[in-house]
């Protein structure tokens, strides 16, 4: 889960057999990873296994029932959970991205890698555009970033820009490429004849 | 299901300015998608002319320059474009769209607007 | 920008005909990482905005009729109507959905002789 910290993986050890309720146990290495890794479609686990058997929600595992709140796929009635009288399992598999295609944080979707860091949000989230680093290089120069930097709330395109000036942040994305307006777009009347 | 509508001037005299508002109804437009303007001149030619985003984000044509400048009314589900300095090349007739979640295609359309620049 | 170039600029067919159109790209449209080509084909009627019919050059929209045959890759796509229908005349449009900005051939007209 290339947008998580390393630090949410803590090593257990194969022997130990027991990881923290809202971590899956690697099952080679032993390593905890969060369950929310769990069928993610990447592979945290060295030997993979956080993505096999990712047609049923692994949602009885420690004997939680019903998961703890934030996991992935919400358990539904699984038969070993105590008094539930649906037996059927909740198919929460989530198809794999394609090869060369990214996942957007908060949702299923997948898109091509060429559209991250391309100035266009195509994540409902915009995740595709996030976190694109200081200092980066753009491709293809073909504008300079002039004029005052303006916030990620008024992100505009990035795309066949080059970048002059002070470090393009989260904090101060400057309006260069295909843009030509830098503001957010947002009123709060009906418009106006310019 | 989602409907989109625009709604504008018929005519426009040319260096002045249109604006047009395109009204969403069975979706709201900070939740998701992209919201786009397109427009198709006389002779059918179809232009791409820029978005809003759901998180407020706007990116247009550059063929468009500054004239361009796509905003919205999250109060009243609408977004707008305004283009200025308006010639007779801009007559054409102008579509709100959108597209499937992250897609660059266009599956919902409003009926269309007629704009003449005209003096 | 990327040009798109659709061939020919008009057709006339009969009812039951196979027709096929051609759009060129002046840039590929073939994304390496997962091999999808980004390319949609619209069908236009008079007074009507353009529905879509196919994307990723290749697959139909739901409800389309199976018709409507998208093919190609890289830079040659094409669309074929194995048996025209009477309501199949129209303008048909491709477009570049793969890099900003969006870009659309001038159009295919289908007439009836």
């Known amino acids: 889960s290339p947008l998580s910290t390393p630090t949410s993986a803590q090593a257990a050890g194969p022997s130990s057999g027991s990881c923290p309720p809202t971590k899956f146990q690697c099952r080679t290495s032993g390593l905890c990873v969060p369950l929310t890794w769990r069928c993610d479609r990447d592979l945290d686990c060295s030997d993979g296994s956080d993505e096999e058997e990712c047609r049923i929600e692994p949602c009885t595992q420690k004997g939680q029932c019903p998961p703890p709140p934030g996991l992935p796929c919400p358990c539904t009635g699984v038969s070993d959970c105590s008094g539930g009288t649906d037996k059927k399992l909740r198919n929460c598999s989530r198809l794999a991205c394609l090869a060369g295609e990214l996942r957007c944080t908060l949702s299923d979707d997948c898109i091509p890698l060429t559209w991250r860091c391309d100035g266009h949000p195509d994540c409902p989230d915009s995740s595709d555009e996030l976190g694109c680093g200081t200092n980066e290089i753009l491709p293809e120069g073909d504008a300079t970033t002039m004029g005052p930097p303006v916030t990620l709330e008024s992100v505009t395109s990035l795309r066949n820009a080059t970048t002059m000036g002070p470090p393009v942040t989260l904090e101060s994305v400057p309006s260069v490429g295909n843009a030509t307006s830098s503001s957010a777009g947002d009123q709060s009347g009906s418009p106006t004849a310019y | 299901d989602v409907q989109l509508q625009e709604s504008g001037p018929d005519l426009v005299k040319p260096s002045q300015s249109l604006s047009i508002t395109c009204t969403v109804t069975g979706y709201s437009i900070t939740s998701d998608y992209s919201w786009h303007w397109i427009r198709q001149f006389p002779g059918n030619k179809l232009e791409w002319m820029g978005y809003?985003?759901?998180?407020?984000?706007?990116n247009y044509n550059p063929s468009l320059k500054s004239r361009i400048s796509i905003t919205r009314d999250t109060s009243k589900n609408q977004f707008f474009l305004h283009l200025s300095s308006m010639t007779n090349e801009d007559t054409a007739t102008y579509y709100c769209?959108?597209?499937?979640?992250?897609?660059?295609?266009?599956?919902?359309w409003g009926a269309g607007t007629t704009v003449t620049v005209s003096s | 920008d990327i040009v798109m170039t659709q061939s020919p600029s008009s057709l006339t067919v009969t009812a039951g005909e196979k027709v096929t159109m051609s759009c060129k790209s002046s840039q590929g449209l073939l994304d390496s990482g997962n091999q999808k080509n980004y390319l949609t084909w619209y069908q236009q009627k008079p007074g009507q905005p353009p529905k879509l019919l196919i994307y990723w050059a290749s697959t139909r929209k739901s409800g389309v009729p199976d018709r409507f045959t998208g093919s190609g890759s890289g830079t040659d796509f094409t669309l074929t109507i194995s048996s025209v229908q009477a309501e199949d005349l129209a303008v048909y449009y491709c477009q570049n959905d793969y890099t900003y900005p969006l870009t659309f051939g001038a159009g295919t007209k289908l007439e009836l002789k």
């Open positions: 809003i985003h759901s998180s407020g984000i706007t």
């Open positions: 769209t959108r597209p499937p979640v992250v897609t660059r295609y266009f599956d919902v």
